[in-house]
Amino acid sequence: TQNKALPENVKYGIVLDAGSSHTSLYIYKWPAEKENDTGVVHQVEECRVKGPGISKFVQKVNEIGIYLTDCMERAREVIPRSQHQETPVYLGATAGMRLLRMESEELADRVLDVVERSLSNYPFDFQGARIITGQEEGAYGWITINYLLGKFSQKTRWFSIVPYETNNQETFGALDLGGASTQVTFVPQNQTIESPDNALQFRLYGKDYNVYTHSFLCYGKDQALWQKLAKDIQVASNEILRDPCFHPGYKKVVNVSDLYKTPCTKRFEMTLPFQQFEIQGIGNYQQCHQSILELFNTSYCPYSQCAFNGIFLPPLQGDFGAFSAFYFVMKFLNLTSEKVSQEKVTEMMKKFCAQPWEEIKTSYAGVKEKYLSEYCFSGTYILSLLLQGYHFTADSWEHIHFIGKIQGSDAGWTLGYMLNLTNMIPAEQPLSTPLSHSTYV
């Protein structure tokens, strides 16, 4: 008789990241008997939901069910049927929904209610949909990358699992850039965290971590662009905005009503003598950089030192993983290599922004124009945020590692969120048998 393979004793988990610009579904898998070991959970699937972020379904929540169908059906296919009922599903909404809730709690609640109802229709163990705080978003991103880098493991390895991994147990800081917010999270060196709102204490695998985190709402790349436009149109002499953050020859008409739709531009709102204006790109990195810096208020700091807008930031310490839009933008610009210095990045950005729009469109024919047009702004914004916002220098730039995936799992808050909610990161170091790591080391 033929030998039958024993059924794989594995578990699955699903997390939906409901971001400001889109929703992504992640499926994670791990060996059931090694739940408490570090580094055993890995991502087996990412499904990007077609369409915008869930906050855009305001007043048309009836469309949410259809919106989620494809990716939820994909999860049904990937996860064995016998596991469906035991597979937890979590949805976390981030800054897009935080902004919606600021404007209307009722609208935000309606969206979440319908999301919950839609997800409850699937055969999985739905655990709820909620808007996570900026602090959680930062913390879970930090947990994710350090878990995947093996930083919580007490066993030192003689080999490195990723090119930028150092063999010490110093954790990496986490830099996350979304469409509507950005997070900075790291363990400062023997530094008191002066503002309690920015302090987190963790005990993970028997070790204590005092972590600094802050989420800057409205400073994700999309909302930062709206802020910049709202600021710059204030001083425009007519309905033409000559914008250094767009390529020469680029033109786009913007509705003033769209500009002022987001709470992020409220501080710049004024009555304008026109209902539309035209962006005309002039493609000048230096001027774009200067314009972006005006979004950061560095004149006021009630602490020993600040990032911007009066927010405490301790001195930077150690290596940082920069992920999400930090990675996607820099990857597009071909600037993720460890060997590229900050000066070189700046040089390349100057050249890129100065390229005529027609030339850019030809060079990147496969890229949607909406996204393509914003890479000059986004790249410049990343440099401005990291250098002037977070005080990285030309020297400390080499400590920033632009990370898309680690060990096949996306860097981001979703894995950390699931690990926490499924209690898979113990406070104490689990007692392991001599062979407990043998199957995956």
Epitope: Q59, V61, N62, S104, L107
Partner: antibody
């Protein structure tokens, strides 16, 4: 109490433009979309489309694409319907109707209606 | 487009009667049907939503039923103030469409 108050009757010539207002009170304007409905004399109701009062995004029924425009003045809790290049067949009463929210399974219904604005197009 | 057919254009009734107005959808609309009452010179008023849910303040003599393609509005004890046009409406998919209307008249 909740009210939708529309602007008064209009007498227009073919080719002209008319702009009808619908002022909402008694509720949070951005929490509910606004529908527009046409009723020609002695005829039934025809849905023209709706505007998302939170995002400002309009949705038009096929028969009302082109000459018709929905807009908002959120600070004044007011929705507008503009009809350009008026034709005789635009003679009708136009209603604004709130897109009320009623939860699962169908979510929406037109729960509050304006009193209607009569538009007469005649040369 | 989904066509909503109200086959009876007019219905003659008497006070105290039980009146049933029917509406047929050209395709399945689930329970996404509303009923409106319109009196001469007035705007429509919502009576029933989601096929069978009575709107706030609507007298309980008005009842909605049906799902899929066949829907009924029933007035169990006809009153003189119920003389009006009645429209069904589907909002299962765009464009939203109304029935042609049924006018209730006194015999």
């Amino acid at each position: 109490q909740i009210q939708l108050v529309q602007s008064g009757p209009e007498l227009k010539k073919p080719g002209e433009t008319v702009k009808i207002s619908c002022e909402a009170s008694g509720y949070t304007f951005i929490n509910y979309g606004m529908n527009w409905v046409k009723q020609a004399p002695g005829k039934g109701l025809k849905w023209m489309g709706w505007i998302n009062t939170y995002t400002g995004e309009p949705t038009y029924a096929d028969d009302f694409k082109g000459r018709f425009a929905f807009s908002l003045e959120t600070s004044a809790n007011t929705a507008y319907l503009q009809i350009n290049n008026l034709k005789n067949e635009d003679t009708a009463t136009y209603f604004c109707a709130r897109k009320g929210y009623y939860g699962y399974p169908n979510y929406y219904a037109m729960d509050y209606w304006g009193q209607g604005t009569s538009v007469t197009v005649s040369s | 487009d989904i066509v909503m057919t109200q086959s009876q254009k007019f219905m003659s009734t008497s006070v105290g009667d039980r009146v049933s107005i029917t509406c047929k959808a050209s395709q399945n609309v689930g329970t996404a049907v509303a009923w409106y009452q319109q009196k001469p010179g007035q705007s429509p008023k919502l009576l029933i939503y989601s096929a069978s849910n009575r709107y706030t303040g609507v007298p309980d003599r008005f009842t909605g039923s049906g799902s899929g393609t066949d829907f009924t509005l029933t007035i169990s004890n006809m009153q003189s103030e119920d003389l009006a046009d009645y429209f069904c409406q589907q909002y299962s998919s765009y464009p939203i469409t109304f029935g042609t209307g049924t006018k209730l008249e006194i015999k």
